[in-house]
């Protein structure tokens, strides 16, 4: 049965969604304001954002007394969304105050701003490394869901109607579907990854969904009003169930499993794709792009960053 990893503001927790006695285990406690959370399953690493400390942090599972490490501690204000590229070994995040979407290595180095224009309230971010795409929600003045290459290419709005507060976002990697939860319109919808063939999953009976994830045939989401985690069938919306209640303040949620992070080989594995700094996955051939930290230019060879990186 799936393990759910979730941020609870003052801590990050785990709960076995299929357990008989539904009690959560604390992964890391004593936090200020944990908001977004993700993981790298192969290394047992957990990453989270803290919107009060204005930082991205990391620890390891199954390591007694594992230390909390700072990953990014400057230039953040309200990092509301976080996603781990488990294939390219990168972190992607949104910041709704700097109005940026950024990427960096898992240790926070070689940090690059991918998007800084036409963002208002970017929130959730989700990755499909197999196809080189990233997706994010924006619940600002013109609410929408957007898609772009994980290298910052081919940005496109894919959902911009019947949408208001799109808080939660997750990808069904197997069935190639996008799911999102809207806190204002009280629904969970799904669509193809280009935004087409939109369908209702749950409508009208949600209070204030914030984050969304899935495993197998089941969707899981956190709700701010009920302060709990809920589940339902991902196709029909049926089999509704409360997984865990009386939480302090549930925020982001992920299913902690290998199935959510299937491995495959990319050109970035071989000598970092020949890139001196960032090797970012891309939706178009050769399916990767060399990139440089913000403020540093790429040389004409398309692989090496100019001096100063």
């Amino acid at each position: 049965s799936p393990l759910l990893l979730f941020a609870n503001r003052r801590d990050v927790r785990l709960v076995d969604a299929g357990g008989v006695k539904l009690e959560s285990t604390i992964v890391v406690s004593g936090l200020e304001d944990a908001a977004a959370v993700d993981f790298q399953f192969s290394k047992g690493a957990v990453y989270w954002t803290d919107v009060s400390e204005e930082a991205i942090k990391q620890t390891y599972l199954n390591q007694t007394g594992a230390a909390v490490q700072n990953v990014v501690i400057s230039g953040l204000v309200s990092p509301d969304g976080l996603a781990c590229d488990w294939v390219g070994k990168k972190l992607y995040w949104t910041d709704s105050e700097t109005n940026r979407i950024e990427v960096a290595n898992l240790n926070g180095t070689s940090r690059k701003v991918l998007f800084w224009q036409d963002l208002d309230q970017p929130r959730a971010i989700a990755l499909d490394p197999a196809h080189g795409y990233m997706y994010w929600t924006d619940w600002g003045e013109t609410p929408r869901i957007e898609r772009a290459g994980m290298d910052g290419s081919t940005r496109k709005i894919i959902v911009d109607s019947d949408i208001y507060w799109p808080n939660g976002l997750t990808i069904d990697l197997e069935e190639q579907k996008l799911y999102w939860a809207d806190a204002k319109l009280s629904f969970i919808h799904r669509a193809n990854l280009d935004g087409s063939f939109r369908q209702k999953v749950v409508e009208g009976s949600l209070t204030h969904p914030f984050a969304l994830t899935l495993s197998g045939d089941t969707l899981y989401w956190t709700d701010w009003q009920t302060r709990s985690i809920h589940a339902c069938n991902k196709r029909t919306g049926g089999k509704r169930k409360e997984i865990l209640s009386a939480l302090y303040s549930p925020m982001d949620i992920q299913v902690l499993s290998q199935e959510r992070q299937p491995f495959f080989h990319t050109r970035c594995e071989e000598d970092n794709g020949g890139c001196s700094h960032l090797c970012l996955l891309s939706p178009s051939e050769p399916f990767y792009t060399c990139a440089c930290p913000t403020g540093v230019q790429l040389q004409d060879n398309g692989r090496t960053c100019k001096a100063g990186a």
Partner: nanobody, 123 residues
Framework: AVQLVESGGGLVQPGGSLRLSCAAS????????VGWFRQAPGKEREFVAA????????YYADSVKGRFTISRDNSKNTVYLQMNSLRPEDTAVYYC????????????????WGQGTLVTVSS
């Protein structure tokens, strides 16, 4: 935790002005997004305006745009709401609210709020 105290309410004639203040205790006030909400008799509490922690962005309800201005002075742990061209329909109890999570405050789910100050617009 932060404690919020509103002041500056009162009786004013239509077309007049008032400045509301929201004073906060707590030295980390600058890490909070702060908003003003109001509740008229017999109505639901509604969003009026908000300002992000850095003061980099402000937000207003359509009904007050161009008339109300929100600002903050983090050195004084205070957020202000300057209300001009007041109308009878602005009559309400005005509440100050704060949350470290901007997304929460702007989606009307805030951690802290004050007791409110009454604004009456009448001739």
């Amino acid at each position: 935790a932060v404690q919020l105290v509103e002041s500056g309410g009162g009786l004013v004639q239509p077309g007049g002005s008032l400045r509301l203040s929201c004073a906060a205790s707590g030295r980390t006030f600058s890490t909070y997004t702060v908003g003003w909400f109001r509740q008229a008799p017999g109505k639901e509490r509604e969003f009026v305006a908000a300002i992000r922690r850095r003061g980099s962005s402000t937000y207003y309800a359509d009904s007050v745009k161009g008339r109300f201005t929100i600002s903050r002075d983090n050195s004084k742990n205070t957020v202000y709401l300057q209300m001009n061209s007041l109308r009878p329909e602005d009559t309400a109890v005005y509440y100050c609210a704060a949350d470290t999570r901007t997304v929460a405050l702007l989606q009307y789910r805030y951690d802290y709020w004050g007791q409110g100050t009454l604004v009456t617009v009448s001739s």
